[in-house]
Amino acid sequence: LECYSCVQKADDGCSPNKMKTVKCAPGVDVCTEAVGAVETIHGQFSLAVRGCGSGLPGKNDRGLDLHGLLAFIQLQQCAQDRCNAKLNLTSRALDPAGNESAYPPNGVECYSCVGLSREACQGTSPPVVSCYNASDHVYKGCFDGNVTLTAANVTVSLPVRGCVQDEFCTRDGVTGPGFTLSGSCCQGSRCNSDLRNKTYFSPRIPPLVRLPPPEPTTVASTTSVTTSTSAPVRPTSTTKPMPAPTSQTPRQGVEHEASRDEEPRLTGGAAGHQDRSN
């Protein structure tokens, strides 16, 4: 079996002129292609892998949401020579908000890594964006994490930073077929320069208070001291697929396949930092 082979990070790697073909090892009878698109409120980008696969032919599409970071994963396996070039790898640039006053900044600023390399997304070097509230959701937290796509015995990963709906999530993640989007949230402007070592403590957990020793009493009893339950510890969330995971498209839509005449089917594309208006 002969398959197309490439690895795309953001918009580099699977451009048409860079396409390779590979002969699969004996016993390998499917070609695979996987595309993972991530959308923040300031832009989107995609990861993609093509190569010799494993398993059975078929399709698997999944939509995911991590605190307002949207992901759309498409996995396709096929059993013909060079059949693995059907998915569109282009991330659409998000339409700028038509009426900027409809989405005024909410006062929070975050570092934004949308399709940036790991080198460009270090510390305080990435661009800073102003958060805004969109789609009836409040984006007042900042996020620092990673997206990883694994297919055809290849793993490709990129950092993700931006505005999210949660200010206190810790090492949270969502997963799809061969795909993981994970990271932590924080409160306060530009707080997401590095959340890799964030602990589980958050302002919602009451501080530990040293209680004074109990007053001496003549009644012999076992004194038990408990902290108030009025501020429960917020459980960390686990994988949370959207209600309808199959063929779910992020708000702006990730195009399934471009037409032969109109669009270059295989161009890579990382979106610019543009606001989405829906």
């Epitope: 953001a10 918009d11 073909t21 669009e263 089917r265 890579g268 594309g269 990382a270």
Partner: antibody
Framework: EVQLLESGGGLVQPGGSLRLSCAAS????????MSWVRQAPGKGLEWVSY????????YYADSVKGRFTISRDNSKNTLYLQMNSLRAEDTAVYYC??????????WGQGTLVTVTS | QSVLTQPPSASGTPGQRVTISCSGS?????????VHWYQQLPGTAPKLLIY???KRPSGVPDRFSGSKSGTSASLAISGLRSEDEADYYC???????????FGGGTKLTVLG
């Protein structure tokens, strides 16, 4: 119908500068990788520079590195090539080309750049 | 000197079959990158003739075919016609140069 229309070519002295433009229509420009390819008089094709759909990934041929700058304005559906420190050997017809199905599937008609003293 | 090597000229009579070779190296064709062929008629811009080693864009007659093996590729034109008189270029990505490279071009002459 896909159309690519180059402009900005002309006569320039060695060491001078020119800015070429390529106006695109008939396709979603913001989704397409684009390139400049040149052809010296009576010679073969030589790839010059390459820009990704968003403009964040750029490649240059060694012969123009540090002198030429490729850029794009997706809102205007236009590709640019800023050429500085021009040399006699840069004299050529400059084509803008779209990367479509695996290859450069559409080409403009070209604009002639002549570098001479 | 081009990275991909083509014969400078080729010729044939109408109806004949002509083959144009394109020789590369381990950093381009030999690395697995697909090969494309372009046709440039006199005084016009190049036109995509064959992409992805052996596929024809719509509108290209099936008289044109491409193949690839190891570090080389070839373009075959059967049933040669006078309108096939043109320059033909092969192209592929090159890892060392980090960009697409072209062959030097082959001028095809249709005799008689």
């Amino acid at each position: 119908e896909v159309q690519l229309l180059e402009s900005g070519g002309g006569l320039v002295q060695p060491g001078g500068s020119l800015r070429l433009s390529c106006a695109a229509s008939g396709f979603t420009f913001s989704n397409a990788w684009m390139s400049w390819v040149r052809q010296a008089p009576g010679k073969g094709l030589e790839w010059v520079s390459y820009i990704s759909s968003s403009g964040s990934t750029i490649y240059y041929a060694d012969s123009v590195k540090g002198r030429f700058t490729i850029s794009r304005d997706n809102s205007k559906n236009t590709l640019y090539l800023q050429m500085n420190s021009l040399r006699a050997e840069d004299t050529a017809v400059y084509y803008c080309a779209r990367e479509g199905l695996w290859a450069f599937d559409y080409w403009g008609q070209g604009t002639l750049v002549t570098v001479t003293s | 000197q081009s990275v991909l090597t083509q014969p400078p000229s080729a010729s044939g009579t109408p109806g004949q079959r002509v083959t144009i070779s394109c020789s590369g190296s381990s950093s381009n064709i030999g690395a697995g990158y697909v090969v494309h062929w372009y046709q440039q008629l006199p005084g016009t811009a190049p036109k995509l003739l064959i992409y992805d080693n052996n596929k024809r864009p719509s509108g290209v007659p099936d008289r044109f075919s491409g193949s690839k093996s190891g570090t080389s590729a070839s373009l075959a034109i059967s049933g040669l016609r006078s309108e096939d008189e043109a320059d033909y270029y092969c192209a592929a990505w090159d890892d060392r140069l980090n960009g697409p490279v072209f062959g030097g071009g082959t001028k095809l002459t249709v005799l008689g």
